[in-house]
C-alpha cells in the first residue's frame, strides 16, 4: 500500500483543518488508514483522525483543533496498521481557507435599493474576524450571462446596489464568499444562494 499523492491540508483558522490525499489503488480509507496529528507544543497529545473516502483512491480527513495561533505547527503521520506511509507537517496559518459566510439575506423594502447582508463566519476573538473581505455574486436566473461580482473590501458584511442596475420583473440570486488578506488565503466556498424578485420600476418621467 502506498501514497500516490501526498496529503495537502487547509485550515479554517478556527477549529477544522481538512487534509486530502490519493492512494496508489482503491482503498477503504476509514478501515485501513489513520492520520495522527500533534501540535508541536508543550506536551500536546496526539490525536487520531479517521479518514473518509473521497472517490475511489482519494481520502479526506477532518482534523479537529481547539484553537489556532499563527505560529502553530502540526506533525502529521499517515499509518496503515503498523506501517508508516507518510510523515509530514502542516502550519495552519500558511494554508487558510476561510469558512463560508452565512445568513445571506436580501432586503428590498427600500424601493430603489437592494440591500444584501450576511454574517461574518468568525467570532470576534478570531484574528480573521476583522480581516475578511468578500465577493458577492449576483446573477439573473433566466440569463446566466447577466452575472456580476461585487467586491466588498470594507469590514461591514453588507452591500447596497441600486435596484435600477438590475432588470425589472426578473428573479435574481446572490451568493457570497470570503477571503482574508493578511493570511493571503484562498477563497472560501460560496454561501448558499438566496433568491429575490426585482420589482423595481423606473419613475414614470424617466421612461
Amino acid at each position: 500500500m502506498k501514497v500516490l499523492q501526498e496529503p495537502t491540508c487547509v485550515s479554517d483558522y478556527m477549529s477544522i483543518s481538512t487534509c486530502e490525499w490519493k492512494m496508489g489503488g482503491p482503498t477503504n480509507c476509514s478501515a485501513e488508514l489513520r492520520l495522527l496529528y500533534q501540535l508541536v507544543f508543550q506536551s500536546s497529545e496526539t490525536h487520531t483522525c479517521v479518514p473518509e473516502n473521497n472517490g475511489g483512491v482519494g481520502c479526506v480527513c477532518h482534523l479537529l483543533m481547539d484553537d489556532v495561533v499563527s505560529m502553530d505547527n502540526y506533525t502529521l503521520d499517515l499509518w496503515a496498521g503498523q506501517q508508516l506511509l507518510w510523515k509530514g507537517s502542516f502550519k495552519p496559518s500558511e494554508h487558510v481557507k476561510p469558512r463560508a459566510p452565512g445568513n445571506l439575506t436580501v432586503h428590498t423594502n427600500v424601493s430603489d435599493t437592494v440591500l444584501l447582508t450576511w454574517s461574518n463566519p468568525y467570532p470576534p476573538d478570531n484574528y480573521l474576524y476583522n480581516d475578511l473581505t468578500y465577493a458577492v455574486n449576483i446573477w439573473n436566473e433566466n440569463d446566466l450571462a447577466d452575472s456580476r461580482i461585487h467586491n466588498v473590501t470594507y469590514l461591514k458584511p453588507t452591500l447596497r446596489i441600486p435596484a435600477s442596475t438590475l432588470k425589472s420583473g426578473i428573479s435574481y440570486r446572490a451568493r457570497v464568499r470570503a477571503w482574508a488578506q493578511h493570511y493571503n488565503t484562498t477563497w472560501s466556498e460560496w454561501s448558499p444562494s438566496t433568491k429575490w424578485y426585482n420589482s423595481y420600476r423606473e419613475p414614470f418621467e424617466q421612461r
Epitope: 478556527m14 477549529s15 477544522i16 507544543f41 508543550q42 481547539d66 484553537d67 495561533v69 499563527s70 505560529m71 502553530d72 468568525y122 467570532p123 470576534p124 476573538d125 484574528y127 493578511h182
Partner: antibody, heavy 116, light 112 residues
Framework: EVQLQQSGADLVRPGASVKLSCTAS????????MHWVKQRPEQGLEWVGR????????IYASKFQGKATITADTSSNTAYMQLSSLTSGDTAVYHC?????????WGQGTLVTVSA | DILMTQTPLSLPVSLGAQASISCRSS???????????LEWYLQKPGQSPKLLIY???NRFSGVPDRFSGSGSGTDFTLKISRVEAEDLGIYYC?????????FGGGTKLEIK
C-alpha cells in the same frame, strides 16, 4: 519547566500609569495567547484581555478598553500590560496567564496599589 | 456579556464528604466550533489559580480523579467525591467560549 515570572509590586499615584511585565520560560509565547486577569483584594477574577504575540492582535473586555494596553516582545519572550489613568478601583493583583487553549500556566501575580 | 453565577457562595464540608458546586451561564456557552469551553479553577490562599477541569469534563494533568465536571448548555457542576484538606480554597468556573471571557464569582470551600 514552564514558568511565567511577573514584575514586582508597584505603588503608584492616582492618574499615573504603570506597565507590568510577564516573562515566560520553558515555552515560546508565540505559541500561545497571553492573557491578563485582574483580582481585586478579597474579590473574584476578571478577564482583562489577551494578545496573540506573533501578530500583536489584541482583544479586551469592554470595561478595560482604553484602560489597559497589552503588548508583547517576542524577542524577550515577554508580555506587557500598561494601565493608564489609575484610580483606587485599579488597586488589584494582576495575573498574566498563557492560554493554549485553557489557562494552564499562571504568573505569580503583581500587586498594583494606587494611593496618594 | 455572559454572566457566570456560582452557587453556593460558601460551602462548609466535612473531610471525606462529597462537595458539589454549581455554575450557571446566562446564555449558552457553546463556541461556534461546537466545543464548550467551560473550565474550573482552584485558588488556594496566597496562590494563583490552578486549572482543574477543561471543556466541561476533562481533568487537567495531575488533577486527582476525585474531581469531576459535568453539565451542558448553561448548567455545569463540579463534584469532589471525597474532600481532602488540600482541596480547601476558592473554586471558580470560567467560560472561554465568547468574548469577553468571564469567571464565576467563586465558591469558598471550607471545613465544617
Amino acid at each position: 519547566e514552564v514558568q511565567l515570572q511577573q514584575s514586582g509590586a508597584d505603588l503608584v499615584r492616582p492618574g499615573a500609569s504603570v506597565k507590568l511585565s510577564c516573562t515566560a520560560s520553558g515555552f515560546n509565547i508565540k505559541d500561545t495567547y497571553m492573557h491578563w486577569v485582574k483580582q481585586r483584594p478579597e474579590q473574584g477574577l476578571e478577564w482583562v484581555g489577551r494578545i496573540d504575540p506573533t501578530n500583536g492582535y489584541t482583544i479586551y473586555a469592554s470595561k478595560f478598553q482604553g484602560k489597559a494596553t497589552i503588548t508583547a516582545d517576542t524577542s524577550s519572550n515577554t508580555a506587557y500590560m500598561q494601565l493608564s489613568s489609575l484610580t483606587s478601583g485599579d488597586t488589584a493583583v494582576y495575573h498574566c496567564v498563557s492560554r493554549r487553549p485553557w489557562f494552564a500556566y499562571w504568573g505569580q501575580g503583581t500587586l498594583v496599589t494606587v494611593s496618594a | 456579556d455572559i454572566l457566570m453565577t456560582q452557587t453556593p457562595l460558601s460551602l462548609p464540608v466535612s473531610l471525606g464528604a462529597q462537595a458539589s458546586i454549581s455554575c450557571r451561564s446566562s446564555q449558552s456557552i457553546v463556541h461556534s466550533n461546537g466545543n464548550t469551553y467551560l473550565e474550573w479553577y482552584l485558588q488556594k490562599p496566597g496562590q494563583s489559580p490552578k486549572l482543574l477541569i477543561y471543556k466541561v469534563t476533562n481533568r487537567f494533568s495531575g488533577v486527582p480523579d476525585r474531581f469531576s465536571g459535568s453539565g451542558s448548555g448553561t448548567d455545569f457542576t463540579l463534584k469532589i467525591s471525597r474532600v481532602e484538606a488540600e482541596d480547601l480554597g476558592i473554586y471558580y468556573c470560567f467560560q472561554g467560549s465568547h468574548v469577553p471571557y468571564t469567571f464565576g464569582g467563586g465558591t469558598k470551600l471550607e471545613i465544617k
